[in-house]
């Protein structure tokens, strides 16, 4: 199953993320799930994940830095939290889960760029 | 003539980049001419050029915003004052300017991203 | 570090049942999908069945659809294939292994026999 | 369900030697295809993932190249360790499934 990515994203100066991942799905779904994996050197690590139902929205765990939606078979991720040592490459992932058969989906990765602000001068 | 830049360049919070341009000399150049274009779309427009001779100091224009220092055949540039809107692809061009033959060399180019930041809040 | 380790086999009678376990252990065990692939004597590797994450969604190869079934206890690491109506053809080596993020199966147990005779 | 057809069923070569095995794909899997190699009595182990990504702790003389229905696993250099069962696999969709494998061994 094809999955689009944009290939570059900067962070904002807040560390914030956003990108678009897309997903060309080859049946009718109603459970999929979207994971954010990082990928440094040879290493890939989840970042986070969630399972959705078609038409339902993208629930994260409390605890993630992840948030999103969907809409049809795109899903907008939002990363927050992200310092310059977070500079990485970030794959999308998404499973068809139901109904059978599943299928699994790759992108091909979105190198996200982090700069750690300058501190602001201390008030007088 | 071959020249080698890094391909991609984070700017810093503080608008400043900087990255490296090597070139292969062909022959023993005493006078070379280094010139950083940017590239956005199709049009291609110089940021800041200088001249200098082999083993002395690089030295750009007072009002220009490159710095620069040079080792052999390796030339440390640096930009400043940049802004986000300032992101794009900044190509190193290298000239042999003296003695004759004129050889001249340019780079793939290398992406400077550039994030603004946030504005600290007003001191009371 | 990662470990997969079955138990569970030996031999049994034909259309009588048997229960493997599959003990994780070293990783997040309910970030990873867990396969069983089988291996008969001298043959080639055979996919028997998948579960996923939370467990509530499962695979299996026709088979053994009807007679198997894969499931698992987050809280414990196991993973689990209740084997029911066995047959001749059931006899093999009975793998688990972890799905890496990726999708391929990038850990695997070193197995457990599974002998049905009369 | 997707068929997996390697090729050849054996391969006879001697230490050194280069060692080239196909698996072609009933249908496209796109890039999710793995390589496992299998010693006599003991679970397969990834080598190639993705098509062509080797697995963590895999010598770089083990290649993967193709995508579609078209796939190579090329051993550059036979070592004496390689001599075993390579099988690929499909994970891009269930059923999931293996080919039925290539022995390679020493002529």
């Known amino acids: 199953m094809h999955v689009a990515q944009p290939a570059v994203v900067l962070a904002s100066s807040r560390g914030i993320a956003s990108f678009v991942c897309e997903y060309a799905s080859p049946g009718k779904a109603t459970e999929v799930r979207v994971t954010v994996l990082r990928q440094a050197d040879s290493q890939v690590t989840e970042v986070c994940a969630a399972t959705y139902m078609m038409g339902n929205e993208l629930t994260f765990l409390d605890d993630s830095i992840c948030t999103g939606t969907s809409s049809g078979n795109q899903v907008n991720l939002t990363i927050q939290g992200l310092r310059a040592m977070d500079t990485g490459l970030y794959i999308c992932k998404v499973e068809l889960m139901y109904p059978p058969p599943y299928y699994l989906g790759i992108g091909n990765g979105t190198q996200i760029y982090v700069i750690d602000p300058e501190p602001c001068p201390d008030s007088d | 003539m071959h020249v080698a830049q890094p391909a991609v360049v984070l700017a810093s919070s503080r608008g400043i980049a900087s990255f490296v341009c090597e070139y292969a000399s062909p022959g023993k150049a005493t006078e070379v001419r280094v010139t950083v274009l940017r590239q956005a779309d199709s049009q291609v427009t110089e940021v800041c050029a200088a001249t200098y001779m082999m083993g002395n100091e690089l030295t750009f224009l007072d009002d220009s915003i490159c710095t620069g220092t040079s080792s052999g055949n390796q030339v440390n540039l640096t930009i400043q004052g940049l802004r986000a809107m300032d992101t794009g692809l900044y190509i190193c061009k290298v000239e042999l300017m003296y003695p004759p033959p004129y050889y001249l060399g340019i780079g793939n180019g290398t992406q400077i991203y550039v994030i603004d930041p946030e504005p600290c809040p007003d001191s009371d | 570090q990662v470990q997969l380790v079955e138990s569970g086999g030996g031999v049994v009678q034909p259309g009588r049942s048997l229960r493997l376990s599959c003990a994780a252990s070293?990783?997040?065990?309910?970030?990873?999908?867990i396969h069983w692939v089988r291996q008969a004597p001298g043959k080639g590797l055979e996919w028997v069945a998948v579960i996923w994450y939370d467990g509530r969604n499962k695979d299996y190869a026709d088979s053994v659809k009807g007679r198997f079934t894969i499931s698992r206890d987050n809280s414990k690491k196991t993973l689990y294939l209740q084997m029911n109506s066995l047959r001749a053809e059931d006899t093999a080596v009975y793998y688990c292994?972890?799905?890496?993020?990726?999708?391929?199966?990038?850990?695997w147990g070193q197995g457990t026999l599974v002998t049905v005779s009369s | 369900e997707i068929v997996l057809t390697q090729s050849p069923g054996t391969l006879s070569l001697s230490p050194g030697e280069r060692a080239t095995l196909s698996c072609r794909a009933s249908q496209s899997v796109s890039s999710y295809l793995a390589w496992y190699q299998q010693k006599p009595g003991q679970a397969p182990r990834l080598l190639i993932y993705g098509a062509s990504s080797r697995a963590t702790g895999i010598p770089d003389r083990f290649s993967g190249s193709g995508s579609g229905t078209d796939f190579t696993l090329t051993i550059s250099r036979l070592e004496p360790e390689d001599f075993a069962v390579y099988y690929c696999q499909q994970y891009g969709r269930s059923p999931f499934t293996f080919g039925p494998g290539t022995k390679v061994d020493i002529k």
């Open positions: 292994a972890r799905v890496a993020p990726l999708g391929p199966l990038d850990y």
């Open positions: 070293g990783f997040t065990f309910s970030s990873h999908g």
